[in-house]
Interface confidence: low
């Protein structure tokens, strides 16, 4: 899958959504989408 960057502060890597440091929330760095959900 193509990589692309959203202004909202995350990328999609092969359908895997990963946080960047500028995002807010209690679960910085957590992987979502691949597991059961979480912050985007």
């Amino acid at each position: 899958d193509a990589e692309f960057r959203h202004d909202s502060g995350y990328e999609v890597h092969h359908q895997k959504l990963v946080f960047f440091a500028e995002d807010v929330g209690s679960n910085k760095g957590a992987i979502i989408g691949l597991m059961v959900g979480g912050v985007v």
């Epitope: 992987i31 979480g38 912050v39 985007v40």
Partner: antibody, heavy 121, light 111 residues
Framework: QVQLVQSGAEVKKPGASVKVSCKAS????????IHWVRQAPGQGLEWMGF????????NYNQKFKGRVTMTRDTSTSTVYMELSSLRSEDTAVYYC??????????????WGQGTLVTVSS | DIVMTQSPDSLAVSLGERATINCRAS??????????LNWYQQKPGQPPKLLIY???KQGTGVPDRFSGSGSGTDFTLTISSLQAEDVAVYYC?????????FGGGTKVEIK
């Protein structure tokens, strides 16, 4: 405590649209994605997509071919799922859900009570 | 899209006996040594409830009699000693990639 409260049952005619709401409380609204899952009568579960209350970005199941739109209103901590061009096969209970991140700790889920949408002429 | 197939469709087990449900994915749901496979329980008139995530990890508050195993494409949910309150439909689900997908469900009843 975390709560997701959905809007009430709807009856719609084929070709119409329906907009279901999901009001979140008990946590910081922008911290977790809200997913939508539907279940036709006597059938299994089908994931429709999710929206990010933080960014407003959504990811949809392509099965719905542009018929579904998920939005959020941060001022009321509410997420909306709109499904257009309704057909009889869209008759189902629609659930919103929030899932914890997997971060090596505990994971649990929170679901709305479900909204029955009936499509009938 | 990843297709999830469960077997059997229904299962009747005596109280206190073991129940085993199988789930197969059309392609591997593993990534970085983690299996992105979740199990849900759904009772009539209720929303689903997460039982097992990452193939083997118990959700919060889930009784120890529920366990999950497997990796790659083949997974199993085991109820070690069936209780009356375990009568429900059980679904597997992959969350490796979008769209997330569920198995067709397995109805567990008391024999």
């Amino acid at each position: 405590q975390v709560q997701l409260v959905q809007s009430g049952a709807e009856v719609k005619k084929p070709g119409a649209s329906v907009k279901v709401s999901c009001k979140a409380s008990g946590y910081t609204f922008t911290t977790y994605a809200i997913h939508w899952v539907r279940q036709a009568p006597g059938q299994g579960l089908e994931w429709m997509g999710f929206t990010s209350p933080y960014s407003g970005v959504s990811n949809y199941n392509q099965k719905f071919k542009g018929r579904v739109t998920m939005t959020r209103d941060t001022s009321t901590s509410t997420v909306y799922m709109e499904l257009s061009s309704l057909r009889s096969e869209d008759t189902a209970v629609y659930y919103c859900a929030r899932f914890d991140n997997y971060d090596g700790g505990y994971v649990r889920d929170y679901w709305g009570q479900g909204t029955l949408v009936t499509v009938s002429s | 899209d990843i297709v999830m197939t469960q077997s059997p469709d229904s299962l009747a087990v005596s109280l206190g006996e073991r129940a085993t449900i199988n789930c197969r994915a059309s392609e591997s749901v593993d990534n970085d040594r983690i299996s992105f496979l979740n199990w849900y329980q759904q009772k009539p008139g209720q929303p689903p409830k997460l039982l097992i995530y990452a193939a083997t990890k118990q959700g919060t508050g889930v009784p120890d009699r529920f366990s999950g195993s497997g990796s790659g494409t083949d997974f199993t949910l085991t109820i070690s000693s069936l209780q009356a309150e375990d009568v429900a439909v059980y679904y597997c689900q992959q969350s490796k990639e979008f769209p997330w997908s569920f198995g067709g469900g397995t109805k567990v009843e008391i024999k």
